[in-house]
Interface confidence: medium
Amino acid sequence: EPTMYGEILSPNYPQAYPSEVEKSWDIEVPEGYGIHLYFTHLDIELSENCAYDSVQIMSGDTEEGRLCGQRTSNNPHSPIVEEFQVPYNKLQVIFKSDFSNEERFTGFAAYYVATDINECTDFVDAPCSHFCNNFIGGYFCSCPPEYFLHDDMKNCGVNCSGDVFTALIGEIASPNYPKPYPENSRCEYQIRLEKGFQVVVTVRREDFDVEPADSEGNCLDSLVFVAGDQQFGPYCGRGFPGPLNIETKSNALDIIFQTDLTGQNKGWKLRYHGDPMPCPKEETPTSVWEPAKAKYVFKDVVRITCLDGFEVVEGRVGATSFHSTCQSNGKWSNSKLKCQPVDCGIPESIENGKFEDPESTLFGSVTRYTCEEPYYYMENGGNGQYHCASNGSWVNEALSPELPKCVPVCGVPREPFEGKQRIIGGSDADIKNFPWQVFFDNPWAGGALIDEYWVLTAAHVVEGNQEPTMYVGSTSVQTSRLAKSKMLTSERVFIHPGWKLLEVPEARTNFDNDIALVQLKDPVKMGPTVAPICLPGTSSDYNLMDGDLGLIAGWGRTEKRDRALRLKAAMLPVAPLRKCREVKVENPKADAGAYVFTPNMICAGGEKGMDSCKGDSGGAFAVQDPNDKTKFYVAGLVSWGPQCGTYGLYTRVQNYVDWIKKTMQENSTP
């Protein structure tokens, strides 16, 4: 507990002090007082630097004095032999004796008193910025007129803050301008304009005189402008170092003027005004702004129209323009909207073809479609090159978005048939020689693939089975091999309307219009072993002459087997119809004269016993295209015959081309 005075005596005083003692006394007087310590008696063993025995006076970590030896007063009227005065309210006295004393020493006697200190004069650092007033136990600071004492109760400043300027134009100056501004002040001014206007500050060079920066470039006094998260300054020195006009891009500006304790500079004066908030004029190579202006400000509205091939990214799909308003914050409304290149997306894939992966799917990009050659060719779409158009579609050279169509190449066998003779009397064949050859398993018969969805065959093949199962792509029709070949399922069977349906088909003598179409459920995939045969053209070039050669193939009866399990083929010449008429019908169902011969039939064969026979029905009689020697067309279909190994009759397909095309068109798969 602090006391105003007290006495301190060495151990055993006034008797001799003991050896090997260390004792300390903590003196504390009230706050605001110093301590005056008086020694009235001193008798301590003398040694150099008082190393043996001593009394030490400490103020914190600072040694105020160290005493030893004998002292007597110089003043006969006063007992004081030594004194110490400190301006602090705490002091420590420490007494120490060593292990031996050669003589008897009595030690010391001392007392202390609390003394007033003059804070205004006793310290190196002045406690007050302006006026210091001492009193017993303390001091207080005061200020000159127009100054006020800050909350720290030590510093005086000018009351220059709190002004809010809302007028669209105005002038602000430092306190006392153009007289020197007060030291040790922080002046804050606020400019608050209505939204949509930005504060523009103008400071003329000659209107600015603020204490210059120190040697390290730090402003001692400074003027700072703060607008939102941007700061202009700090500024100081003679002559304004900033730009003539400061465009703050904000309707709110705080002006902060901070001064230190010294200086005699005149300060500053500024003008401000509110400009409608500008919005940035953007460089937009992908759009056009209407109206076009050198500068856009608050409340301006522009229509942004995307250039051809560009579109608005967000918002309505496919929008090509939008409106934008210059907002009070200096930002455009709809700023998220941008004109970006139209994206056509990944090109659509096509059946039996592919597209080159475009480098990009944006406006102007190019891709190329190709068909799976050599089995398909492009029916439309020119050379297959498409580009991403401004409407977001991939279009061809004709600017049509219609996708290319890959259609099967017809009539081209992957390997030409080379019969060992010129399927009775025929040779072994490979399905690659006759990729159009279709196998019907019930009844055992043939057909010709003419399109990915259509098989042409003889009417008598399908009249008893309206849901035939067919196979393509296999040379062998053995059960074990067929399981691995491509099975085709029929969707619908179209028998020519001219084919007469009989109660007892076995008794048939009229095979006129022996032609039918089978529509398939699913499209056939073309390849080296599966391809369609062409239809005959309608021109006279496709009229068959006697002696013209055609190829037949099938799995029908041969000399050796009732059913050939491997494909057989033969090349036969066209013969006059009378040749077929002249052959005696084997096991006739009726009188020979009852058998009907019509112009819808082709007679062929008669050479070296080569002929089609049971099980070959519906297969193609394939003739080389007169206008393209690489291709074959289906001139006939195996229909009937008087006797295997002689002449055979084939349905003349040329007479049915219109019916075939019409049926396929009317029943086309979407």
């Epitope: 072994d428 398993d441 019930n442 009844p443 055992w444 008893g464 062998s476 029709v477 053995q478 059960t479 074990s480 067929l482 088909p505 076995e506 009866r557 050796k560 087997r561 009732d562 059913r563 399990l565 491997r566 084997e586 096991n587 049971k614 006797q643 295997c644």
Partner: antibody, heavy 119, light 111 residues
């Protein structure tokens, strides 16, 4: 389903003739081939021959060329085997069979007809 | 004519044991990589039943303990685990060339 039904057992005197029938159902006889096979007592199986009912075209094993005649009537879906100049060695069970699809086999058989030649 | 010879003429095998029948032809019954050799099972009072076609293909509905192998002139029918209902006469038959011919048959019995 496919079925071949044969005529009943026959007992004949030597020198006589006999005509066995085989009626097909479940398939169209004119689209197929009907074969005949002999099984003599204590002997194995022997192929006799076949017919294409659509045109009556026949093939015979050389051994039976003279002995047998195979015919067919598509209107009744029936095939016939006629044995002439019967002798005791003609005593056997005679089977008709259908020629298989996609493999060179007999896939369906009749139940067999027993012919006994005895004086 | 192609002559087909089976061996043995008869075979007695314990139930569950393997039975193997051999069939040799006087000339090859192969054509373009396929063997036209079939196996039939014949039980008394019943028509023959197709087991194996084209030398090694199992006919639909036939138990898989029956298997066939071979090519050219040498063929084998194997019953991997003989069952009581397998007692019968087994015939091989070639269908590569007219006339179609059968082997003399092999009788399989239970030991």
């Amino acid at each position: 389903q496919v079925q071949l039904v044969q005529s009943g057992a026959e007992v004949k005197k030597p020198g006589a003739s006999v005509k066995l029938s085989c009626t097909a159902s479940g398939f169209n006889i004119k689209d197929d081939y009907i074969h005949w096979v002999k099984e003599a007592p204590g002997q194995g199986l022997e192929w006799i021959g076949r017919i294409d009912p659509a045109d009556g075209h026949t093939k015979y094993a050389p051994k039976f060329q003279v002995k047998v005649t195979i015919t067919a009537d598509t209107s009744t879906s029936t095939a016939y085997l006629e044995l002439s100049s019967l002798r005791s060695e003609d005593t056997a069970v005679y089977y008709c069979a259908r020629y298989g699809y996609g493999r060179e086999v007999f896939d369906y058989w009749g139940q067999g007809t027993t012919v006994t030649v005895s004086s | 004519d192609i002559v087909m010879t089976q061996s043995p003429d008869s075979l007695a095998v314990s139930l569950g044991e393997r039975a193997t029948i051999s069939c040799k032809s006087s000339q090859s019954v192969d054509y373009e990589g396929d063997s036209y050799l079939n196996w039939y099972q014949k039980k008394p009072g019943q028509p023959p039943k197709l087991l194996i076609y084209d030398a090694s293909n199992l006919e639909s509905g036939v138990p898989d303990r029956f298997s066939g192998s071979g090519s050219g002139t040498d063929f084998t029918l194997t019953i991997s685990s003989l069952q009581a209902e397998d007692v019968a006469v087994y015939y091989c038959q070639q269908s590569n060339e007219d006339p179609w011919t059968f082997g003399q048959g092999t009788k399989v019995e239970i030991k």
